[in-house]
Interface confidence: low
């Protein structure tokens, strides 16, 4: 089989209580029940992975507790949203995408969604 | 500079138990899954087992082949990897590997450094 | 669990020659790995997800395939390339790796 294909926006800008939010859709070769989606961050050559979920079809996705991202399902497409961005976050954000049940197994990266994040200016002092 | 080293290992008799360890440096131990593989003398590679990574969790996964009697886990705080093995057996005796899985492109699950090895005998 | 199959188990190559090594796997998976190995050193990551070579290693390495049917080619032998190369695969959750090729020089 030929590796899936995942797509996603190329640029997405967080707003300015640092959430931001992309599709990610892959074209499923078969009828998966059984998807885990991850979220990769790539800023100077160095690749982190920021959440992951593993969800059954017509699921919820359900993240770690702590995680900052969350997410919902929609046939073959994943709504995420990462939170808690700060300017420093800035960077390529990849979907991952794995058909885990039933066989055969696929995966599928995406060219990534580069998320940029501007830290909001400080409020002015005021005596009002 | 990556490094992982394994330590550990040693003759130990049938039905014995023995641990081995990772230590590991160079690289932020709670962001990478973490496999074990070993090689009998003068045969092929065999993975054996991986600990995810924080993200997902820190949970295991394990090969047929010594699912039930080996265990991995991981120390965070000194970023060092273990396996546990229990009631071992002669075909158990190899060189064992520690090796790191690595997430970015274009290495997904690929095993992209890897300890030196450490020899383990199951001999009476 | 997932088969891979390496042929040749032995080969051997003057310096020149192009070589080309298989593996095979019993279902279908969506990427190969290769790893070589040279007497009492670790693996080290030769080619990553099925064509994309590691770090240093020289461009007469090539990886190709899809499916079932996957290959390392070498396409002009060196006496450094003499080692053993071990594909791996990744599915569900679990490692495989072939049984290897082990390539010699003439």
């Known amino acids: 089989c030929k590796a899936m294909h995942v797509a996603q926006p190329a640029v997405v800008l967080a707003s300015s209580r640092g959430i931001a939010s992309f599709v990610c859709e892959y074209a499923s070769p078969g009828k998966a029940t059984e998807v885990r989606v991850t979220v990769l961050r790539q800023a100077d050559s160095q690749v982190t992975e920021v959440c992951a979920a593993t969800y059954m079809m017509g699921n919820e996705l359900t993240f770690l507790d702590d995680s900052i991202c969350t997410g919902t399902s929609s046939g073959n497409q994943v709504n995420l949203t990462i939170q808690g961005l700060r300017a420093m976050d800035t960077g390529l954000y990849i979907c991952k995408v794995e058909l885990m049940y039933p066989p055969p197994y696929y995966l599928g990266i995406g060219n990534g969604t580069q998320i940029y994040v501007i830290d909001p200016e400080p409020c002015p002092d005021s005596d009002f | 500079e990556v490094k992982l080293v394994e330590s550990g290992g040693g003759l130990v008799q049938p039905g014995g138990s023995l641990r081995l360890s990772c230590a590991t440096s160079?690289?932020?131990?709670?962001?990478?899954?973490m496999s074990w593989v070993r090689q009998p003398p003068g045969k092929a590679l065999e993975w054996l087992g991986f600990?995810?990574?924080?993200?997902?969790?820190?949970?295991?996964e394990y090969s047929a082949s010594v699912k039930g009697r080996f265990t991995i886990s991981r120390d965070n705080s000194q970023s060092i990897l273990y396996l546990q093995m229990n009631t071992l057996r002669a075909e158990d005796s190899a060189t064992y590997y520690c090796?790191?899985?690595?997430?970015?492109?274009?290495?997904?699950?690929?095993?992209?450094?890897w300890g030196q090895g450490t020899s383990v005998t199951v001999s009476s | 669990q997932i088969v891979l199959t390496q042929s040749p188990a032995l080969m051997s190559a003057s310096p020149g020659e192009k070589v080309t090594m298989t593996c095979s796997a019993s279902?279908?998976?969506?990427?190969m790995y290769w790893y070589q190995q040279k007497p009492r050193s670790s693996p080290k990551p030769w080619i990553y997800?099925?064509?994309n070579l590691a770090s240093g290693v020289p461009v007469r390495f090539s990886g190709s395939g899809s499916g079932t049917s996957y290959s390392l080619t070498i396409s002009s032998m060196e006496a450094e390339d003499a080692a053993t190369y071990y594909c791996q695969q990744w599915s569900s959750n679990s490692f495989t790796f072939g049984s290897g090729t082990k390539l010699e020089i003439k």
């Open positions: 090796a790191r899985d690595s997430l970015a492109y274009p290495h997904y699950y690929a095993m992209d450094y």
């Open positions: 997800l099925t064509s």
């Open positions: 160079g690289f932020t131990f709670t962001d990478y899954y």
């Open positions: 279902s279908s998976v969506s990427y």
């Open positions: 600990i995810r990574n924080k993200a997902n969790g820190f949970t295991a």
